[in-house]
């Protein structure tokens, strides 16, 4: 009888998740990404904050930088120079936008164990990086780029026209940072550090968004950001390259823009160095269905960069916009001219292609009714990539190796059978020449990071297995999760359902739809998470569902591009269709259905609530877009075209939340926004509120003073507590 008695006592000690667990991050997990510094070595910050160098082949490790040194300047980050002579230490981190921040940098000399004195770096610095070889430094200070041949040398100033909110050198402006580059930097060293390429963004003519930052002073501050909304004037971008060996000799040389791009408004989308004397630039028309990849060569005789038309490769979409969320970037082959790139095949699935002379002659490397998602590394004999091919689940990610050093190329799934139940969603990080690699598994089980041999794929060791988390979860009643699909009118709607621990199909449960639904997004993923919705299922007995409808990614262009020029229609329809299907399953209380979303999800949840279906009792919109005329040009126009009469103004007007104000009369609506949201401006919610007041529709609202789009810090606790009360009230659940 003992085993069953133990089992019973275990049952009794099991507890539900609490909101406090979620807000305290009690069940957060760790990942391990090696900071590779060679084919067989990586750096890692140990638990006691020493910076340790590990050599995989010798099995040895040693501390290259002590926690004492880190602490002496309050360093929160570090960067080792490639020649291993210096380390930069980063402190006084001050966040700006999503990726950008400023910091103070100190250079520590490993050879003598002292900080470099003399010619210290100015502060605060906007971006700093080592050259890929040696220990040259490039940095951006007050929107200008500086170069140091050695850390102790005086700086050489490369640009002089940098001006706050006007001219940005080596760093992106707001819209390029958020919507195009997805980085805090806009400068790129050539592979051996001979050249430095950089972007200059001229925001002089861009309209400015201004909002109050209340702070603690008598008068609020006004934050001004050049922010092009749909149809507005855009930044003017130019790309320059300077020879860092003799920077004063000819100075920065501008890289020419392809003629077919320069003929109208355009964007620069990415830069990839191929060799020290060959660079690849990607450009995009403002109407983002044409992208041009241009390969440019250094002309020694003229000291200029030549981009022959024969080395221009055009990628055009006839059914939507170019690429997925962004246009993919090339991964060059060893011949330094041909490359691998992901783009749509003739069947409308994103796959890896090999391009040599022309895109028309591209050789398709992967194919099938699934999508290649990322090319990690190309070596002389292997290409490593991720896809969602395995077992036809779009929300999974496995790592594959294609042998390209022999014919026919053979494909092997590296991860599919490693920890099949625990791990179905991977990413990878490769050392030089793919000698070794780390696999990071995000779920659906507890995340685990492992180290592997790049030739044999053998697991060498576990880098992080989240044992503490595993132990902490042993007495927690976690909700059940299932990922399934609905087939509706030739559309496949994948969904994730989070069910209460003691779920009983014969009972009725309140349903909460969590929606994002933005173009090229994916919510239904086989990943581990213990978050707010886990708590709602575990403790409050709700069923939560996430549905990937039209416009979402990795299931082919038909689904992805269905929303082209029609945002706010099919995304909403598909959430509603799914809800109807869930009701048919028999365990949903159709009088207690809610929907909530954040950002794009707030837009969709608002439109769903105002759809007039009578399906939803209540809903929440956090930081929603309310009109596409209020959002950033780069993002909005990609999917919607221009808000002009001869383009797509009509749908811009038809797709606003405000136009549906009347329909909110029969739902309980909670509208939430941060007043210092630099991304989706408070203006969006202000206009919804105004329209609801004008229509005399009651609603609830919460603003978060001086909070941005992330509603972080104490606001997070307040937000989730407030939303919990709202939902419990809506679902008549006792507090």
């Amino acid at each position: 009888l003992r085993p069953s008695r133990v089992h019973n006592s275990e049952e009794n000690t099991m507890r539900a998740l609490t909101l406090k667990d979620i807000l305290n991050g009690t069940f957060s997990y760790k990942t391990f990404f090696p900071n590779w510094i060679s084919g067989q070595e990586y750096l890692h910050q140990s638990a006691d904050n020493n910076i340790v160098l590990y050599n995989i082949e010798t099995g040895q490790s040693y501390t290259i930088l002590s926690n004492r040194t880190m602490k002496s300047v309050n360093a929160s980050n570090y960067g080792l120079s490639p020649d291993r002579q210096f380390v930069y230490l980063e402190s006084d981190y001050s966040k700006l936008w999503r990726y950008s921040y400023t910091a103070t940098y100190y250079i520590y000399d490993l050879s003598n164990g002292e900080f470099v004195r003399g010619n210290e770096l100015p502060r605060p610095i906007q971006y700093l990086c080592w050259s890929p070889v040696g220990s040259k430094l490039a940095y951006v200070y007050q929107n200008n780029i500086y170069l140091k041949q050695r850390p102790g040398d005086p700086p050489f100033q490369i640009t002089f026209n940098g001006r706050e909110n006007k001219i940005f050198n080596g760093i992106p402006d707001w819209v390029y940072e958020e919507e195009m580059l997805a980085t805090k930097y806009a400068l790129w060293w050539s592979p051996n550090g001979k050249f430095l390429a950089y972007a200059e963004f001229n925001d002089t003519d861009i309209p400015v968004i201004a909002y109050s930052y209340y702070g603690d002073e008598q008068y609020p501050r006004t934050i001004n950001i050049p922010y092009p909304k749909a149809g507005a004037k855009n930044p003017v971008v130019r790309i320059f390259i300077i020879d860092t060996t003799y920077p004063a000799y000819v100075g920065p040389q501008e890289v020419p823009v392809p003629a077919m791009i320069a003929s109208s408004d355009y964007y620069f989308s990415w830069l990839t160095w191929v060799t020290d004397e060959r660079v690849c630039l990607q450009w995009l028309k403002r109407v983002q269905n044409v992208s041009v990849l241009s390969i440019c060569d250094f002309r020694e005789d003229w000291q200029t960069w030549d981009c022959p038309k024969t080395q221009e490769h055009i990628e055009e979409s006839r059914t939507g916009w170019a690429g997925g969320f962004f246009v993919s970037t090339p991964v060059f082959s060893y011949d330094a001219i041909s490359y691998y790139k992901i783009f749509s095949d003739k069947d409308g699935y994103k796959h890896i292609h090999y391009i040599k002379d022309t895109v028309e002659n591209a050789i398709q490397i992967t194919s099938g009714k699934w999508e290649a998602i990322n090319i990690f590394r190309v070596t002389q004999d292997s290409l490593f990539y991720s896809s969602n091919e395995f077992e036809e689940y779009p929300g999974r990610r496995n790592i594959y190796r294609i042998s390209i050093g022999s014919y026919p190329p053979s494909k092997k799934c590296v991860t599919c059978h490693l920890r099949k139940e625990r791990c179905q969603y991977y990413t990878a990080s490769f050392s030089d020449y793919a000698k070794y690699y780390a696999l990071v598994c995000y779920g659906p089980g507890i995340p685990i990071s492992t180290l592997h041999d790049g030739r044999t794929d053998q697991e060498i060791k576990i880098l992080e297995e989240n044992k503490e988390l595993e132990n902490a979860l042993k007495n927690i009643q976690l909700p059940k999760e299932e990922i399934k699909k609905l087939e509706v009118d030739e559309i496949t709607l994948w969904y994730k359902m989070i069910l209460p621990p003691q779920f009983d199909r014969s009972k009725k449960y309140p349903l909460l739809i969590q929606v994002y639904g933005g173009p090229c997004s994916q919510s239904v993923r086989s990943v581990f998470a213990v978050n707010w919705i886990s708590y709602l299922a575990s403790k409050e007995g709700m069923v939560i569902a996430l549905v990937d409808g039209r416009g979402t990614a990795f299931q082919g262009d038909k689904l992805l591009y269905a929303v082209y020029r029609k945002l706010g229609v099919y995304e909403v329809e598909d959430q509603i269709t799914a809800v109807r299907k869930f009701i048919e399953m028999g365990f949903i209380d159709e009088k207690r259905i809610a929907i909530w979303g954040w950002s794009y999800g707030g837009y969709v949840s608002s439109l769903a609530l105002a759809s007039g279906t009578g399906l939803f009792k209540c809903g929440i919109a956090v930081a929603p877009v309310s009109s596409w005329e209020y959002y950033a040009s780069v993002y909005t126009e990609r999917f919607m075209g221009l808000p002009t009469k001869d383009d797509n103004l009509e749908h811009y007007k038809n797709s606003t939340v405000m136009a549906r104000a009347e329909y909110f009369r029969n739902v309980d609506y909670l509208l939430i926004h941060g007043t210092a949201d630099d991304n989706v401006h408070f203006q969006n919610s202000a206009q919804i509120a105004k329209a609801l007041v004008n229509a005399q529709v009651d609603f609830q609202a919460m603003w978060y003073s001086d909070q941005n789009h992330g509603l972080s810090g104490l606001s997070t606790n307040h937000l989730y507590t407030h939303m919990t009360h709202f939902l419990k009230q809506c679902f008549s659940l006792s507090d």
């Epitope: 082959s333 060893y334 011949d335 050789i363 002389q380 390209i404 014919y407 026919p408």
Partner: antibody, heavy 122, light 106 residues
Framework: EVQLLESGGGLVQPGGSLKLSCAAS????????MSWVRQAPGKGLEWIGE????????NYTPSLKDKFIISRDNAKNTLYLQMTKVRPEDTALYYC???????????????WGQGTTVTVSS | LVMTQSPASLSASVGETVTITCRAS??????LAWYQQKQGKSPQLLVY???TLADGVPSRFSGSGSGTQYSLKINSLQPEDFGSYYC?????????FGGGTKLEIK
């Protein structure tokens, strides 16, 4: 030992047709790209076209695209060149050639047959 | 792409070093092969990727070049080296040959 043996050459009248064959042995024919090359008497080499291992890609020199058809039968280890609408200037020694896969994604012509002669004359 | 080979012919003695050049009308990015053809025989691959020697080719042969200009160098000519030499690009179809260089014994 690798062998490529062309056959099917001979005398053909202008405007006529002819089908050349190339029998392969000594290597895994089904994994090789194959090409046809011709050489007019006393002249240089002229590339006619190529075919990939599974016949999904066939490329021709533009001037011959509409009159020559390259095909293969991997089960028979044989490469074909169907010639139509021939003219006197098509008189040449016709070689088939095959070769190793070269990284990245192209093929050299490592192996050549001894050639078969086609004479176009009335 | 047009491949221009020079010289069309040259005579040299055993033991000498000769260089044959090949110019492409556009960059072919090292996608170049060299062949040797002896009288009445089929061509034979000597060099690919502009500078890699094919299996069994003596080390006195060497290929070089980049962009549009390529050359084949034969050091210390041997009696068996006399014949015709052709370059061929593999950059984009059609994979054209150069006009050939006839190397004769002096």
């Amino acid at each position: 030992e690798v062998q490529l043996l062309e056959s099917g050459g001979g005398l053909v009248q202008p405007g006529g047709s002819l089908k050349l064959s190339c029998a392969a042995s000594g290597f895994d024919f089904s994994t090789y790209w194959m090409s046809w090359v011709r050489q007019a008497p006393g002249k240089g080499l002229e590339w006619i076209g190529e075919i990939n291992p599974d016949s999904s890609t066939i490329n021709y020199t533009p001037s011959l695209k509409d009159k020559f058809i390259i095909s293969r039968d991997n089960a028979k280890n044989t490469l074909y060149l169907q010639m139509t609408k021939v003219r006197p200037e098509d008189t040449a020694l016709y070689y088939c050639a095959g070769g190793y896969y070269r990284y990245p994604y192209y093929y050299t012509m490592d192996y050549w047959g001894q050639g078969t002669t086609v004479t176009v004359s009335s | 792409l047009v491949m221009t080979q020079s010289p069309a012919s040259l005579s040299a003695s055993v033991g000498e070093t000769v260089t044959i050049t090949c110019r492409a009308s556009g960059s072919i990015h090292n996608y170049l092969a060299w062949y040797q053809q002896k009288q009445g025989k089929s061509p034979q691959l000597l060099v690919y990727n502009a500078k890699t020697l094919a299996d069994g080719v003596p080390s006195r042969f060497s290929g070089s070049g980049s962009g549009t200009q390529y050359s084949l160098k034969i050091n210390s000519l041997q009696p068996e080296d006399f014949g015709s030499y052709y370059c061929q690009h593999f950059w984009s179809t059609p994979y054209t040959f150069g006009g050939g260089t006839k190397l004769e014994i002096k």
